[in-house]
């Protein structure tokens, strides 16, 4: 503790100019005071002034008023500082002395004589209020007041609490009268060193370094840090925890970039064709007769399906076609014959079989020939076997499909992905996206094509368990464990009997 006992001398009266021994001062009593402050004693005794002592210069002769003086010699009130907890009780001895010597340092003069003394014993609480008193004896009267106040930065009823206001990173506070801390606006905590974050800032996912701020921890975003950041590259998905990619309805894949309901969302098939959610592009169009192309967008000639039989020639009309039949045939498609086997109707070595008691016939054609009279060489391209706009070409007994760029396979049914060029360096895994390939990098690499070597590899310590694959570069300053079937957890450490979920972030 630390405080000051203050004594204000106000007036001293010694009208007859007498000393305590009954002698008079010549020419008058040149008066100074000695003050001794000590612990409480029921009976005041001589001995050390345990709480302090002080002397004044000569303040006047015989009777005088003592003026307040804040500096230099003759300071009034007198100050008796102490460096301990104020006990609340005290003993005070005030002695008035006459000196024949030096005004300023009468203590040192020989021949000093006592005029009078008073003793005060009692209790005194710390406070700013002055306690005023007056003491008389037969010859003198002394008016005075006194109090105990705490030194700067000390507080409480015994001046025992040290408190220094501050406004730095070890505290932002002022001091209450009892020495407790009163936090400045925006700060809290025992030492007022914890900022009060923006109202509503998420307790776990956000923090602040100054008041009314909300800084998000990795994986979180938004003004209040209450929105998770989904997996990097997540297209049609959301998250409930950071780096998750839970697909919206109708979407699938690690990045929710595969449209599981392309037919409904985009209606790609034209001219009444049927759309099914399958195939390399996520859909397949099945065309109505008379249409072709990937989206059945190409209308065929009405004669394209070769409707005229028995060598009839087909002629396109506005919404239909007309068959010109060869001799011996009639009907809309020249399907009826007036010929019999006797007319040798079967060409190219076909054998004739009589039907309906010889009134009609049927030809059995040798290989590579077709038609009711074996008049047509087999065209293996008529069934439009080439998908995705591929061109069909007859090659003797077989046929081949010439595919458009970006497709392959015997029927051009396979989509050549952007990943076929192996754009991912250092063993990165390639994912086809609409806007080009995306690489998921192995441990130790990052960048769009896994071309950047990471110096501090979060996967180097092998954080993923149970054979899980570790990826970096998917989340800031972090790694992702892609769990095998039957395991979950941020490090794939928990076995479950559930189907595999999305990767957990560590």
């Amino acid at each position: 503790g630390s405080g000051i006992f203050q004594l204000r001398l106000q007036e001293f009266v010694n009208q007859r100019g007498m000393l305590a021994n009954g002698q008079s001062c010549e020419p008058g009593c040149r008066t100074f005071f000695r003050i001794c402050l000590k612990h409480f004693q029921a009976t005041f005794s001589e001995g050390p002034c345990t709480f302090g002592n002080v002397s004044t210069p000569v303040l006047g002769t015989n009777s005088f008023v003592v003026r307040d003086k804040n500096s230099g010699s003759g300071r009034n009130p007198l100050q008796l500082p102490f460096n301990f907890t104020w006990p609340g009780t005290f003993s005070l001895n005030i002695q008035a002395w006459h000196t024949p010597g030096d005004d300023l340092r009468p203590e040192t003069s020989p021949g000093n004589s006592l005029i009078s003394q008073i003793i005060i014993q009692g209790s005194l609480a710390v406070g700013k209020i002055w306690r005023t008193d007056e003491q008389n004896d037969t010859l003198t009267r002394l008016s005075y007041s006194y109090r105990v106040i705490c030194s700067d930065n000390y507080y409480g009823e015994s001046c025992s609490r040290l408190c220094k206001k501050r406004d730095d990173h070890f505290g932002h506070y002022e001091c209450q009268p009892d020495g407790s801390l009163s936090c400045l606006p925006g700060w809290t905590g025992k030492y007022c060193d914890q900022p009060i974050c923006l109202s509503g800032c998420h307790e776990q996912n956000g923090y602040c370094s100054k008041p009314d701020e909300c800084i998000c921890r990795p994986g979180w975003q938004g003004r209040l840090c209450n929105e998770c950041i989904p997996h990097n590259g997540c297209r049609h998905g959301t998250c409930s925890i950071p780096w998750q990619c839970a697909c919206d309805e109708g979407w699938g894949g690690l990045f929710c970039d595969q449209d599981l309901n392309y037919c409904t969302h985009h209606s790609p098939c034209k001219n009444g064709s049927t759309c099914s959610n399958s195939g390399p592009k996520g859909y397949t169009c099945t065309c109505l007769p008379g249409y072709t192309g990937e989206h059945c967008e190409l209308g065929l000639s009405k004669c394209a399906s070769n409707p005229c039989r028995n060598g009839g020639s087909c002629k396109d009309q506005e919404n239909s076609y007309h068959c010109l039949c060869p001799p011996g045939y009639y009907g809309q498609h020249c399907e009826h014959s007036t010929l019999t086997c006797a007319d040798s109707p079967c060409f190219n070595g076909g054998s004739c079989r009589e039907r309906n008691q010889g009134s009609s016939y049927a030809c059995e054609c040798p290989p590579n020939f077709t038609g009711s009279n074996c008049e047509k060489k087999v065209d293996r391209c008529t069934s439009n076997p080439c998908a995705n706009g591929g061109q069909c070409q007859n090659r003797g007994p077989s046929r081949t499909c010439r595919c458009r760029p970006g497709f392959t396979g015997t029927h051009c049914e396979l989509h050549i992905s952007d990943c076929a060029r192996s754009p991912c360096a250092h063993g990165g895994t390639c994912h086809d996206l609409e806007n080009g390939p995306v690489c998921t990098c192995p441990a130790g690499f990052s960048g769009r094509r896994c071309e950047v070597r990471i110096t501090h590899d979060a996967c180097a310590s092998g954080p993923c368990f149970n054979g899980a694959t570790c990826y970096t570069g998917l989340s800031p300053n972090n790694f992702v464990c892609n769990c095998p079937y039957g395991f979950v957890g941020s490090r794939c450490e928990f076995p479950v009997g559930l189907p595999p979920s999305f990767p957990w972030v560590a």
Epitope: D152, N153, L162, K164, K165, D168, H169, F170, Y207, S209
Partner: antibody
Framework: EVQLVQSGTEVKKPGESLKISCKVS??????????WGWIRQMPGKGLEWIGD???????YYNPSLKSQVTISVDTSFNTFFLQWSSLKASDTAMYYC?????????????WGQGTMVTVSS | EYVLTQSPATLSVSPGERATLSCSGQ??????ASWYQQKPGQSPRLVIY???KRPSDIPARFSGSNSGDEATLTISSLQSEDFAVYYC?????????FGQGTRLEIK
């Protein structure tokens, strides 16, 4: 018992970069009661406060040194760092890390053993 | 820039005697002062914090005070292990400030 263990002696050339570390053991760097400081002592000279960092990443620097150094923290490794992008000969000094305690009104009760950095061409 | 000035730069005292080290700075009494002891080849060690408090491992012969413009470290009866360099330290807003040190040597 809290211990601050610093990385080893470094000898560098002017213009080179450097990052020294201070690993905290026996306690968490993420406690709200502490800041983690760096103090330097040039050969034959007194102590000079460089700056400190809170576990959240908030930093405070000596205004006379601010632009020359960077203090960072990695809570997952319970470690904090002092780094230079371009060293000068005048950076030659012993560098101490210390724990500054809010409860001790900013007094540093635990110190690292020191990292001697020598910068010379 | 806040400055702490320690005096004397070197203090020669005999073992068993009292040593008083001073640290002055503008209105230093309104700040909390700490004192550190450093021996050759060793890291500094906290001996006084919050003006006058001692860490549990520091002997009672070390005491401190701080008022006005001056903080004082007093070692009541010097032991051989007390001879070292002593630094005072205070915080000026968000910046730590050390004095230049006082070397306490055997007389």
């Amino acid at each position: 018992e809290v211990q601050l263990v610093q990385s080893g002696t470094e000898v560098k050339k002017p213009g080179e970069s450097l990052k020294i570390s201070c690993k905290v053991s026996g306690g968490s760097i993420s406690s709200s009661s502490y800041y983690w400081g760096w103090i330097r002592q040039m050969p034959g000279k007194g102590l000079e406060w460089i700056g400190d960092i809170y576990y959240t990443g908030s930093t405070y620097y000596n205004p006379s040194l601010k632009s020359q150094v960077t203090i960072s923290v990695d809570t997952s490794f319970n470690t904090f760092f002092l780094q230079w992008s371009s060293l000068k000969a005048s950076d030659t000094a012993m560098y101490y890390c210390a724990r500054e305690d809010v409860i001790l009104r900013g007094g540093s009760d635990y110190w690292g053993q020191g990292t001697m950095v020598t910068v010379s061409s | 820039e806040y400055v702490l000035t320690q005096s004397p730069a070197t203090l020669s005292v005999s073992p068993g005697e009292r040593a008083t080290l001073s640290c002055s700075g503008q209105r230093l009494g309104d700040k909390y002062a700490s004192w550190y002891q450093q021996k050759p080849g060793q890291s500094p060690r906290l001996v006084i914090y919050e003006d006058s408090k001692r860490p549990s491992d520091i002997p009672a012969r070390f005491s401190g005070s701080n008022s006005g413009d001056e903080a004082t470290l007093t070692i009541s009866s010097l032991q051989s292990e007390d001879f070292a360099v002593y630094y005072c330290q205070a915080w000026d807003r968000d910046t730590g400030v050390f004095g230049q040190g006082t070397r306490l040597e055997i007389k």
